[in-house]
């Protein structure tokens, strides 16, 4: 079982376990997302991402989730008994991100730039919202992220 984001291979992650961890946390912790008209991971961010581009984009998105979303969500988790599931999700994101080594070759600049523009669409949408609202929405959209990542999962 492995992810293949273009030439970037990731082993040691069982995708259904990520879904299970996400559902456990979301069903226990997730507060109401009242702004349903806005999506952070909008279709333009994830639509028709090439294999080569996927390595850059996955790296950027997972890094953001770890450093911004999960880090700030941890305080919410403390009140509930789902730390194990939250840790499963976060630790697997770390495992994936640590194995993603996007090429720094100059020939890949157009591809990395395209991935960066996609990521910026997401980050801008996040920053336009109140911090608390943005965190709730971003965590709620982990399912959109996992759905996209699933396309690169091989058995």
């Amino acid at each position: 079982q492995e992810f293949r984001f273009g030439s970037c291979q990731v082993t040691g992650v069982v995708l259904p376990e990520l879904w299970e961890a996400f559902w456990t946390v979301k069903n226990t912790v997730q507060t109401q997302d009242d702004i349903t008209s806005i999506r952070l991971l909008k279709p333009q961010v994830l639509r028709n991402v090439s294999g080569a581009e996927s390595c850059y984009l996955a790296h950027s998105l997972l890094k953001f989730y770890l450093n911004t979303v999960f880090k700030n969500y941890h305080s919410k988790i403390a009140k509930f008994k789902v730390l194990r599931s939250f840790s499963t999700l976060a630790n697997n994101f770390i495992v994936i991100m640590s194995q993603l080594q996007p090429s720094k070759d100059n020939s890949m600049l157009p591809i990395s730039e395209s991935a960066h523009q996609r990521f910026l669409l997401f980050r801008r949408a996040f920053k336009q919202l109140d911090t608390e609202v943005a965190l709730v929405k971003a965590f709620g959209e982990v399912d959109i992220l996992l759905t996209w990542m699933q396309k690169f999962y091989h058995l």
Epitope: Q1, L15, P16, W23, D143, I144, Y153
Partner: antibody, heavy 119, light 108 residues
Framework: ELQLVESGGGSVQPGGSLRLSCAAS????????MYWVRQAPGKGLEWLSL????????FYADSVKGRFTISRDNAKNTLYLQMNSLKSEDTAVYYC????????????WGQGTQVTVSA | SYELTQSPSVSVAQRQTAKITCGGD??????AQWYQQKPGQAPVMVIY???RRPSGIPERFSGSNSGNTATLTISGAQAEDEADYYC???????????FGGGTHLTVL
């Protein structure tokens, strides 16, 4: 050899109940999500329910929510579907299925059990 | 709720290429699966995650998924490929597995 064998089907009157079982063998049952899917006579496939490895999360189609309950006994390698308040439109062949391992991919299916709801 | 749309029937001459499509809003961002079902039998998965073949499925079966359409291609269709084919995806917003209505493939 991987096998999924459904049982518990039969005829029942509207408003009645049935409990379907699916006996699994040939794989590590506790490692896989399981599903129930049905097919009414001459119709297409309709997903009913999904249960995760430890039963911690369950999901249902709107058509059966509140009436059907999915469960599993990992010690017995068995999947269940408790069906209450049955209606004539629940008449169908009921299949259990095993996830391929990637999630949301019904990699192996049983042969199905017939459920008929009729007065 | 999320819907997947398939044309009810497709015909193909033996040894020719058959294409069966599955339409859904931005289905390209989801993983699409395909199942084959012959009369009186349980369905069999022929494609998962858009384009991957489970072991035991002939190479003539392939899949693609982009934009609003997922496609199952059977290159060099055989008489034994005559069956109903269903596409399927996961709708994360409704937490539901969704099947298309099915396409009956006739091999002439």
């Amino acid at each position: 050899e991987l096998q999924l064998v459904e049982s518990g089907g039969g005829s029942v009157q509207p408003g009645g109940s049935l409990r379907l079982s699916c006996a699994a063998s040939g794989f590590t049952f506790s490692n896989y999500w399981m599903y129930w899917v049905r097919q009414a006579p001459g119709k297409g496939l309709e997903w009913l329910s999904l249960i995760t490895t430890d039963g911690g999360s369950t999901f249902y189609a709107d058509s059966v929510k509140g009436r059907f309950t999915i469960s599993r006994d990992n010690a017995k390698n068995t999947l269940y579907l408790q069906m209450n308040s049955l209606k004539s439109e629940d008449t169908a062949v009921y299949y259990c299925a095993k996830d391929l391992g990637s999630g949301f991919s019904l990699g192996s299916w049983g042969q199905g059990t017939q459920v008929t709801v009729s007065a | 709720s999320y819907e997947l749309t398939q044309s009810p029937s497709v015909s193909v001459a033996q040894r020719q290429t058959a294409k069966i499509t599955c339409g859904g809003d931005n289905i390209g961002s989801k993983s699409a699966q395909w199942y084959q079902q012959k009369p009186g039998q349980a369905p069999v998965m022929v494609i998962y995650s858009d384009s991957r073949r489970p072991s035991g499925i002939p190479e003539r079966f392939s899949g693609s998924n982009s934009g609003n359409t997922a496609t199952l291609t059977i290159s060099g269709a055989q008489a034994e490929d005559e069956a109903d084919y269903y596409c399927q995806a996961w709708d994360s917003s409704a937490n539901a597995v969704v099947f298309g209505g099915g396409t009956h493939l006739t091999v002439l």
